[in-house]
């Protein structure tokens, strides 16, 4: 059969027709439309936007577009009882208070329903005490404080700067250290790039700007009250005391003007080294407490936010496949924002909208994809990936049997320097081949391919002439699909130059200043980077849904498995005596990786040679490719993290945003020298090697000839 059995457009023009239909001007128009008012999860405004998107996707030509609603736990500030932090004197009088809201950006002064900065899911409380500065509140920062500096955070309020790791990990670390409250702030060292003006004159964070965000430690659970199951009409909900991942101490975020007032009085220990100093004109003393003249003053938090079960709405659009309608390629990104969502998420949602429009145009001309494409506008991502996770829990049986791939579509830009891709190794070759066919939007690369500019600006650390592709971590809606269900996943966006810009994320992330104007004036006036991201995301979806043989290369998994095995072995070999004492061997893992490599190589050879006109054999080979990612799922999950089930990748236990390879072994080895029972600890390392080796071997066998 021709490669075009699902369509009446000539094969070689399929992808071209789809890509040519994507227009920067449309993405710009959609972004403007999506960013004029706040679309906070659980609000009427976001429900109205869901209905608008449903209506427009129908107009664009999708076969069906439905709303899927769930009743999940969300968190909001108390409108009449604002959250703030005070410095109090010995009489308990408040001598300084942090801001109650951000100064609104020009043109938005009269917009209602701008949620003030808060840490979503913080418990209520009014703790008061001495302050301890804990740098980024990473695991290693608390090790430095407790082990090296002998500073006890128990009963203290800690102040930590945003950046480096997910804020929920910071709060978890502070709780474990015994803190009774956490203040999060944005330091100019991390959120103010040198030589750039503050918003509205540039893309830097002003002193009154504050990063919102949730502080959960869900570990993939979704709605905290219904872990593992959808939060539907007949759901059984846990009590709040049994909810998953909620913080136990009050937490509140502030900007650097307010942070200056808290940090300038800090006394106690000096910072241990320069890596603990930010860019404020303060000593960055660790504390505890204020210096001499101010030693009787304390810090008091006033947190009155409430957790409420609230209805959320996903929009799910379907474009039915002509040949394999029971195989699903999913393109999803969230719709809910903290405020205007100029970058997060609407720069992504606008791209999805244009991709849907382009697919719809082709469909109206008589074309259909080979496989079914599902489009999703997720709700409540900012509150813990709730919309995507609940939908996947509700549809898990279908997804695990039919899910080919998931492409994520949150923010299209976090800079305008080069492409950034995180994906399963199965998609490496797809991404390479696609970017070689796309034009680079970068200055100085006119007439060159995206692959070329990307490789030049972001080279692979291992393979010369190839671009860097990173591991998937979490902190976005692909999590449930990849980490829980084992569906091959990927994400792409334009990013900053990490070499020259050391700040974390982009400066205005989750602030009121993330507006349409931020994008249109400073990041992408021509929307050429948005268009490129649309071409990459849309092109991946097109190929995954339309190619006769799935565009997965299992040999690339073999390569990374060897790399990850080498890495974890070298970590373990930092303890040669214990490995000998407890007979720790990685032989089984290396043997499994070797077997995987050989079987993957043979499978790839068969893939070149088989009769593609035989639909049964074609389907069989494609199913082996589709189910390979699924084969890395351990139904029992990782220790204490049952919804992280992928044995090769999981979000780091120390930073949800980062991916860790062989996470079970890694966590078993982490800080093993401090474990009270070394025999038990090394026993767990051995067990995790066993699980990993078995899983790799089992996955390899799914690629063997079936009989």
């Amino acid at each position: 059969k021709s490669s075009n059995e699902a369509t009446n457009i000539t094969p070689k023009h399929n992808m071209k027709a789809f890509l040519d239909e994507l227009k920067a001007e449309n993405i710009k128009k959609f972004l403007y439309n999506f960013t004029q008012i706040p679309h906070l999860a659980g609000t009427e405004q976001n429900f109205q936007l869901a209905k608008q998107i449903q209506s427009q996707w129908k107009e664009f030509g999708l076969d069906s577009v439905e709303l899927a609603h769930y009743d999940v736990l969300l968190s909001y500030p108390n409108k009449t009882h604002p959250n703030y932090i005070s410095i109090i004197n010995e009489d308990g009088n408040e001598i300084f208070n942090t801001s109650l809201f951000e100064p609104p950006p020009p043109g938005y002064e009269n917009v209602s329903d701008i949620v003030p900065p808060f840490s979503a899911f913080s418990p209520q409380g009014m703790p008061e005490g001495d302050l301890v500065y804990v740098n980024y509140a990473r695991t290693e920062d608390f090790f430095k404080l407790e082990r090296d500096m002998k500073i006890n955070c128990s009963g203290k309020i800690v102040i930590a700067r945003y950046g480096k790791v997910f804020r929920g990990n910071k709060v978890k670390n502070a709780q474990l250290a015994g803190a009774k409250g956490v203040i999060l702030y944005s330091d100019p060292a991390d959120y103010f790039a040198p030589g750039v003006k503050s918003y509205p004159d540039g893309w830097n964070l002003p002193g009154g700007g504050v990063q919102r965000g949730n502080i959960l430690n869900l570990n993939g659970a979704g709605d905290p009250l219904t872990p593992g199951y959808p939060a539907n009409e007949y759901a059984y909900r846990r009590g709040i005391a049994e909810a998953v991942g909620l913080p136990s101490i009050p937490v509140h975020p502030i900007g650097y003007y307010d942070a200056q007032k808290l940090l300038e009085k800090m006394g106690g220990s000096a910072p241990p080294d320069s890596s603990w100093r930010g860019s404020l004109k303060v000593p960055y003393n660790v504390g505890p407490g204020f210096t001499g003249n101010f030693s009787t003053q304390k810090v008091k938090m006033h947190i009155h936010s409430t957790n409420e079960v609230t209805r959320i709405y996903n929009v799910i659009g379907t474009l039915r496949g002509a040949v394999e309608p029971d195989r699903y390629v999913i393109l999803g990104g969230h719709r809910d924002s903290w405020v205007f969502g100029g970058i997060d998420p609407q720069s992504g949602a606008a791209v999805v909208h244009e991709i849907v429009r382009s697919f719809g145009t082709l469909k109206k001309e008589g074309w259909r994809p080979r496989r079914t494409i599902l489009f999703a506008s997720w709700d409540a991502e900012e509150f813990g990936l709730l919309g995507s996770t609940e939908w996947a829990e509700e549809n898990s049986r279908l997804l695990q049997e039919r899910g080919v791939a998931y492409i994520n579509a949150d923010s299209s830009i976090e800079g305008n320097y080069t492409l950034r891709v995180d994906c399963t190794p199965l998609m490496y070759s797809l991404v390479h081949n696609l970017t070689k066919e796309l034009k680079s939007p970068d200055e100085g690369f006119e007439g060159k391919s995206l692959y070329e500019s990307w490789t030049k600006k972001s080279p692979s650390p291992e393979f010369s002439g190839m671009p860097r592709i990173s591991k998937l971590g979490s902190g976005n809606d692909f999590e449930v699909f990849f980490q829980r269900l084992g569906i091959a996943s990927g994400r792409a966006r334009y990013t900053k130059n990490w070499e020259t810009n050391k700040f974390s994320g982009y400066p205005l992330y989750h602030s009121v200043y993330e507006t349409y104007e931020l994008v249109e004036k400073f990041y992408d006036p021509m929307f050429k980077y948005h268009l490129t991201v649309a071409q990459v995301r849309g092109g991946m979806v097109f190929e995954l849904a339309n190619s006769i043989v799935l565009p997965f290369d299992c040999r690339d998994y073999a390569v990374v498995l060897r790399k990850y095995a080498d890495k974890i072995y070298s970590i373990s070999m930092k303890h040669p005596q214990e490995m000998k004492t407890y007979s720790v061997s990685f032989d089984s893992l290396f043997s499994a990786v070797k077997n995987f490599t050989e079987i993957a190589s043979k499978f790839s050879e068969r893939l070149q040679d088989f009769d593609k006109s035989n639909p049964i054999v074609l389907r069989m080979m494609n199913d082996q490719l589709m189910f390979l990612e699924r084969a890395f799922i351990d139904p029992l999950g990782l220790p204490d993290r049952p919804f992280y089930r992928h044995v090769i990748y999981a979000p780091s236990s120390h930073n949800k945003y980062a991916g860790e390879s062989f996470p079970g072994i890694y966590d078993a080895l982490f800080d093993i020298e401090s474990k009270v029972d070394p025999s038990k600890a090394w026993g767990e390392v051995k067990r995790q090697i066993y699980v990993a080796a078995f899983t790799v071997q089992a996955a390899a066998e799914t690629l063997s000839e079936v009989a």
Epitope: Y84, F96, N97, T98, S99, L100, F101, E102, P103, P104, P106, E109, P206, G207, G208, G209, G255, Y257, D258, Q260, K261
Partner: nanobody, 123 residues
Amino acid sequence: EVQLVESGGGVVQPGRSLRLSCAASGFPLISYGMNWVRQAPGKGLDWVAFITYDGSNRYYADSVKGRFTISRDNSKNTLHLQMNSLRPEDTAVYYCAKDRIVGARVPDAYDIWGQGTMVTVSS
């Protein structure tokens, strides 16, 4: 046009009260800290009070602490100064002044002034 217009001044007996107002136009009051500054006859300028853009902090000169209260209504673009227990030494022209920096947490330099309103405390 960016401007500040003060009102509410007048002649008042010692121990009595007066409420000054300042109407802002041409800029978003909600984004800026605001000050009251006064100039007694034949004297230099004296800072009186400051309120942050969001009303979370108020600072006062020692000479007026406990007697004067600065407040603001961002929805109406107005600033107020409630002056109680007035004294003859409070006699001055009172100016409202906009802080230069968006979102400042403490008084900074002023960049926009009103024309002033005269307050005379006399028996």
